[in-house]
């Protein structure tokens, strides 16, 4: 899969889980760097991935809510991320400065199912995202919505 960032260091990866969705995220940020990431798979938190330290932000996804797009910012290390969800919400972690890239699936309808990358003592050197179809398909047609949402926090 595609990796963002300069790379280098030890590899990390979330547990491959074919039975649960990502239901929450913890991201630790310190000294202007993203230190570590941790995903909740179903009801259980997976192992923390990355470097030690930092202050931890935790977000919980609603039932049927998925991460569909991620912006990442690098300056030697991962500086920040914005995660967009299928319910028009977004979560900021760290600061979006430096080299900004967007990550999204090549297949319509796929969602975030895993995170991998490389880390060193100070933080995350590269990050990649695994996308796949959700385990539960939508049961109804999305509502016809002819209203327009406010501008996104990140430019197109």
């Amino acid at each position: 899969g595609k990796m963002y960032g300069p790379g280098g260091g030890k590899y990390f990866s979330t547990t491959e889980d074919y039975d649960h969705e990502i239901t929450g995220l913890r991201v630790s940020v310190g000294l202007l760097l993203v230190k570590s990431v941790q995903v909740k798979l179903g009801d259980s938190w997976d192992v923390k991935l990355g470097a030690l330290g930092g202050n931890t932000q935790e977000v919980t996804l609603q039932p049927g809510e998925y991460i569909t797009k991620v912006f990442v910012a690098f300056q030697a290390f991962l500086r920040g991320m914005v995660m967009y969800t299928s319910k028009d919400r977004y979560f900021y972690f760290g600061k979006l400065d430096g080299q900004i890239s967007s990550a999204y699936p090549s297949q319509e309808g796929q969602v975030l199912v895993g995170i991998y990358g490389q880390y060193q003592l100070l933080g995350i050197k590269s990050i990649g995202f695994e996308w796949n179809y959700p385990l539960e398909e939508p049961t109804t047609e999305p509502p016809v919505n002819l209203t327009y949402s406010a501008n996104s926090p990140v430019g197109r």
Epitope: Y104, S106, Q107, G109, Y133, L135, V144, N145, Y148
Partner: antibody, heavy 119, light 112 residues
Framework: QVQLKESGAELVRPGALVKLSCKAS????????MHWVKQRPEQGLEWIGW????????IYDPKFQGKASLTADTSSNTAYLQLSSLTSEDTAVYYC????????????WGQGTLVTVSA | DIVMTQSPSSLAVSAGEKVTLSCKSS????????????LAWYQQKPGQSPKLLIY???TRESGVPDRFTGSGSGTDFTLTISSVQAEDLAVYYC????????FGGGTKLEIK
């Protein structure tokens, strides 16, 4: 109900470019990816790519990278396909398409636009 | 790239006959996470846009007559029309949605 209305037939010169439109009604294109498919005369279907009109993200089949450019205007609920450096190989019917309530499958199709490249 | 190969390229049958169309993919379309095959069948009648018939290899789209049945898994798939009607004259395409989207070359069904 869901409708995709494509622009009229085009006769264009080799080397020129053409921009086709697909006007959606019955839904907001912001909520769906818009796909484009090529069909050469008496031949099969080829997927060109998709655009996410809300964010402007695009993905192309590698063989159409550099040939096709997808854009969308959410204010007019319209998706566009631009084809550049046209040759006789680009003579085809071009369809826009949209999924139904499930992703991965194209449940709604436009009527198609015939592009003829000829000197 | 996933390559989709359909056979035969054309066939002619009489109304009421059973017909079987084949589609093979160059790699498995079975998603190990969702345990579903990302294969669809489309019907394109002369002068018309394609129409979705079957998805997930075997699920019939609503409104599609039950004489159309999809089967198969992995790399080998089949569309069966149990009793061909005159209105089934069309080209039938399979399409994978496992990695990007690729159509097969199509099978042209003619009625004798």
């Amino acid at each position: 109900q869901v409708q995709l209305k494509e622009s009229g037939a085009e006769l264009v010169r080799p080397g020129a470019l053409v921009k086709l439109s697909c006007k959606a009604s019955g839904f907001n294109i912001k909520d769906y990816y818009m796909h484009w498919v090529k069909q050469r005369p008496e031949q099969g279907l080829e997927w060109i790519g998709w655009i996410d009109p809300e964010h402007g993200n695009t993905i192309y089949d590698p063989k159409f990278q550099g040939k096709a450019s997808l854009t969308a205007d959410t204010s007019s609920n319209t998706a566009y396909l631009q084809l550049s450096s046209l040759t006789s190989e680009d003579t085809a019917v071009y369809y826009c398409a949209r999924r139904g309530w499930l992703p991965a499958w194209f449940a709604y199709w436009g009527q198609g636009t015939l592009v003829t490249v000829s000197a | 790239d996933i390559v989709m190969t359909q056979s035969p390229s054309s066939l002619a049958v009489s109304a009421g006959e059973k017909v079987t169309l084949s589609c093979k993919s160059s790699q498995s379309l079975l998603n190990s996470r969702t345990r579903k095959n990302y294969l669809a069948w489309y019907q394109q009648k002369p002068g018309q846009s394609p129409k979705l018939l079957i998805y997930w290899a075997s699920t019939r789209e609503s409104g599609v007559p039950d004489r159309f049945t999809g089967s198969g898994s992995g790399t080998d798939f089949t569309l069966t029309i149990s009793s061909v009607q005159a209105e089934d004259l069309a080209v039938y395409y399979c399409k994978q949605s496992y990695n990007l989207y690729t159509f097969g070359g199509g099978t042209k069904l003619e009625i004798k």
